[in-house]
Amino acid sequence: EPPTACREKQYLINSQCCSLCQPGQKLVSDCTEFTETECLPCSESEFLDTWNRETRCHQHKYCDPNLGLRVQQKGTSETDTICTCEEGLHCMSESCESCVPHRSCLPGFGVKQIATGVSDTICEPCPVGFFSNVSSAFEKCRPWTSCETKDLVVQQAGTNKTDVVCGPQDRQR
């Protein structure tokens, strides 16, 4: 009886169970009653990452420098090229087809997590007791100055955008 299902790493064609091609190789010819599946390695700029019956290998991804991309990991016959973004840029999407500049955290916000090649800057509002007076992709919220430790008093309260202003204590005569 001809098979209706095949083992793992096989496929059914013309009532025959044929071996799939291993990762890094493409199908040249299906198996027959007389022959095993014929496979050929992908060329240098191509890959296939699964056991397959593809007659064409996939082209490696191109990391286009005009889109701010560079190669993070060179592709092999079994893996695609992995692109990442140049310094100061991050991927626009998960597939990283182009890059955009990291965003800066506006005054009143500090950097919670510095951007990487694949993720944007994460900002957080400065909580009470902290401030940020710059627009920056690196600066965290800084604590207000402690006037007391300098033997000074608060002359102007701090905000999330400004530090406190300290001044001398009024001396009582």
Epitope: N14, S15, Q16, S19, V28, T32, F34, T35, E38, T55
Partner: antibody, heavy 115, light 112 residues
């Protein structure tokens, strides 16, 4: 239905070349290798080699590597075998054959090499 | 090259008899994929060969079940349980495990 059509006979002079044809029909030509087999009276059968019409890739019996050239014309679904520097030893019936989902043979071309 | 040796060269039988043809190879025909690419076919006078059995024991579509193949490694047998007139001709074994593919010399099945 699958058919492999071959001319019935060819008569050629010693030292000359001949190009035998095998026209395929009834299936997708590029999906299956075409193989060639030689049969001389009282000498049994010999496998010459095969060609993959998809990419023109060949595999050969070393014995026939310098004698036979295998090609295909995808536009006409025809496989060819050219035999060169013919001698009386090349006089034989030449079959083309295809397998995969059944085995199919042409009717054979009788090649006579004679002056 | 793998040498395929068929015996007998000639096999006279009476119609209705059982016939048995042997084929031995000079090396194992077990492929690394687990298949054994040993095949049988029949050639009648003036005709192209007609395949009967592939991979030792699998009958091609339309081949009567009186034909059966068996064996492994280097030793193979084709049996015809009840010979009919249409079965007469030359039987060949062939192997496609190793390149070049090779054929047995043939066994002529004829009437006693």
């Amino acid at each position: 239905q699958v058919q492999l059509q071959q001319p019935g006979a060819e008569l050629v002079k010693p030292g000359a070349s001949v190009k035998l044809s095998c026209k395929a029909s009834g299936y997708t030509f590029i999906s299956y290798y075409i193989y060639w087999v030689k049969q001389r009276p009282g000498q049994g059968l010999e496998w010459i080699g095969g060609i993959n019409p998809r990419n023109g890739g060949t595999n050969f019996n070393e014995k026939f590597k310098s004698k036979a050239t295998l090609t295909v014309d995808k536009s006409s679904s025809t496989a060819y075998m050219q035999l060169s520097s013919l001698t009386s030893e090349d006089s034989a019936v030449y079959y083309c054959t295809r397998h995969g989902n059944g085995v199919y043979w042409g009717q054979g071309t009788t090649l006579t090499v004679s002056s | 090259d793998v040498v395929m040796t068929q015996t007998p060269l000639s096999l006279p039988v009476s119609l209705g008899d059982q016939a048995s043809i042997s084929c031995r190879s000079s090396q194992s025909l077990l492929h690394s994929n687990g298949n054994t690419y040993l095949h049988w076919y029949l050639q009648k006078p003036g005709q192209s060969p007609n395949h009967l059995i592939y991979q030792v024991s699998n009958r091609f579509s339309g081949v009567p079940d009186r034909f059966s193949g068996s064996g492994s490694g280097t030793d193979f047998t084709l049996k015809i349980s009840r010979v009919e007139a249409e079965d007469l001709g030359v039987y060949f074994c062939s192997q496609t495990t190793h390149v070049p593919w090779t054929f047995g010399g043939g066994t002529k099945l004829e009437i006693k």
